[in-house]
Interface confidence: low
């Protein structure tokens, strides 16, 4: 018995920032688990975590160097990432793992979200000027 | 990003006493299992102790070598860990890192390594 | 007290080999072993937990098997950056003595 994600197409980032919603087939009231969202066609790089707990608070993170943040729904996990490169457009994929009460269960692969980086480049500050072109 | 940092190494000469400093940032800090390691030059990895995060209870365990000697702590309010040594031996010299388990899954049961490490902050002890 | 026996304490192997390194619990573990590696002058780095499971970005080439008392870490074909000391660990967190991959 697989979970299923709901994740939209496409998202564009323009002020290099996105809200990215995954939507469950569980609600994930009173259980523990952990939603995780992958960057790459391969889900190479763990983007971001949330982890949650009936009896702690939620848990947020990033080992990859992401800037993100997390909100909870009754069956949906939504992960807000800052500081996006335009370099950092690619496929996105949403994960959740129930943990308790058992069975363990984890989710179908879902189609994922293109995230269209559009925003500003992220330029040095004019009052720091890199080096200047011939 | 999910980051440790450690300070408050130095030389201490035996029988001394020494506090190093841990502070975390990138995580809910007050819930996370914290872990003192140390490394004595050319040794291996030693765990020293760990403290429990706030939500289980936060209470303290120790390796055999120290205690009695060492205090784990932690300011919640400053997302910060200490190590109190007290009563330093020689044998205390090495590079002490503070690591916590982001784990895979939270608490003892579901303990699942030490993946986040900071850079470690050197400790000396000698006459 | 749990001890953690590394064989061998040192493996001297050239880039391309495929490196076997052992970890022995003297009481059973269940599978609540991890592996690290530490290169000179650097905080370890976790490559496997719970024996098997590799870690956020950690190469396919490093496996963990075993449970209870035996445990393996395998590096498929080594990489010139794989030459370092690698650790075992289980849950109540004593380490294994380490064993050191070198260049032959």
């Known amino acids: 018995n697989k979970i299923l994600v709901k994740q939209s197409p496409m998202l564009v980032a323009y002020d290099n920032a996105v809200n990215l919603s995954c939507k469950y087939s569980y609600n994930l009231f009173s259980r523990e688990f952990r939603a995780s969202l992958h960057k790459g066609l391969d889900s190479a790089v763990e983007v971001c975590v949330v982890y949650g707990n009936y009896s702690q608070q939620l848990q947020v993170y990033s080992k990859t160097g992401f800037n993100c943040d997390g909100k909870l729904g009754n069956e949906s996990v939504t992960f807000y990432l800052q500081n996006l490169y335009v370099n950092q457009t690619d496929i996105y994929f949403c994960k959740i793992e129930v943990m308790y009460p058992p069975p363990y269960l984890d989710n179908e692969k879902s189609n994922g979200t293109i995230i269209h980086v559009k925003g500003k480049h992220l330029c040095p500050s004019p009052l720091f000027p890199g080096p200047s072109k011939p | 990003e999910v980051q440790l940092v450690e300070s408050g190494g130095g030389l201490v000469k035996p029988g001394g006493s020494l506090r190093l400093s841990c502070g975390g940032s990138?995580?809910?800090?007050?819930?996370?299992?914290m872990n003192w390691v140390r490394q004595a030059p050319g040794k291996g990895l030693e765990w020293v102790g760990r403290?429990?995060?706030?939500?289980?209870?936060?209470?303290?365990d120790y390796a055999a070598p120290v205690k009695g000697r060492f205090t784990i702590s932690r300011d919640y309010s400053k997302n910060t860990l200490y190590l109190q040594m007290n009563s330093l031996k020689t044998e205390d010299t090495g590079v002490y890192y503070c690591?916590?388990?982001?784990?895979?899954?939270?608490?003892?049961?579901?303990?699942?390594?030490?993946?986040?490490w900071g850079q470690g902050t050197t400790v000396t002890v000698s006459s | 007290e749990i001890v953690l026996t590394q064989s061998p304490a040192t493996l001297s192997l050239s880039p391309g080999e495929r490196a076997t390194l052992s970890c022995r619990a003297s009481?059973?573990?269940?599978?609540?072993l991890a592996w690290y590696q530490q290169k000179p002058g650097q905080a370890p780095r976790l490559l496997i937990y719970?024996?098997?499971n590799r870690a956020t970005g950690i190469p396919a080439r490093f496996s963990g098997s075993g449970s209870g008392t035996d445990f393996t870490l395998t590096i498929s074909s080594l990489e010139p950056e794989d030459f370092a000391v690698y650790y075992c660990?289980?849950?109540?967190?004593?380490f294994g003595p380490g064993t050191k991959v070198d260049i032959k």
């Open positions: 990138g995580f809910t800090f007050n819930n996370a299992w």
């Open positions: 690591t916590t388990y982001l784990p895979y899954y939270y608490g003892s049961e579901r303990w699942s390594g030490m993946d986040v």
């Open positions: 719970d024996a098997s």
């Open positions: 403290i429990k995060g706030k939500t289980d209870g936060g209470t303290a």
């Open positions: 009481q059973s573990v269940s599978s609540y």
């Open positions: 660990q289980q849950r109540s967190n004593t």
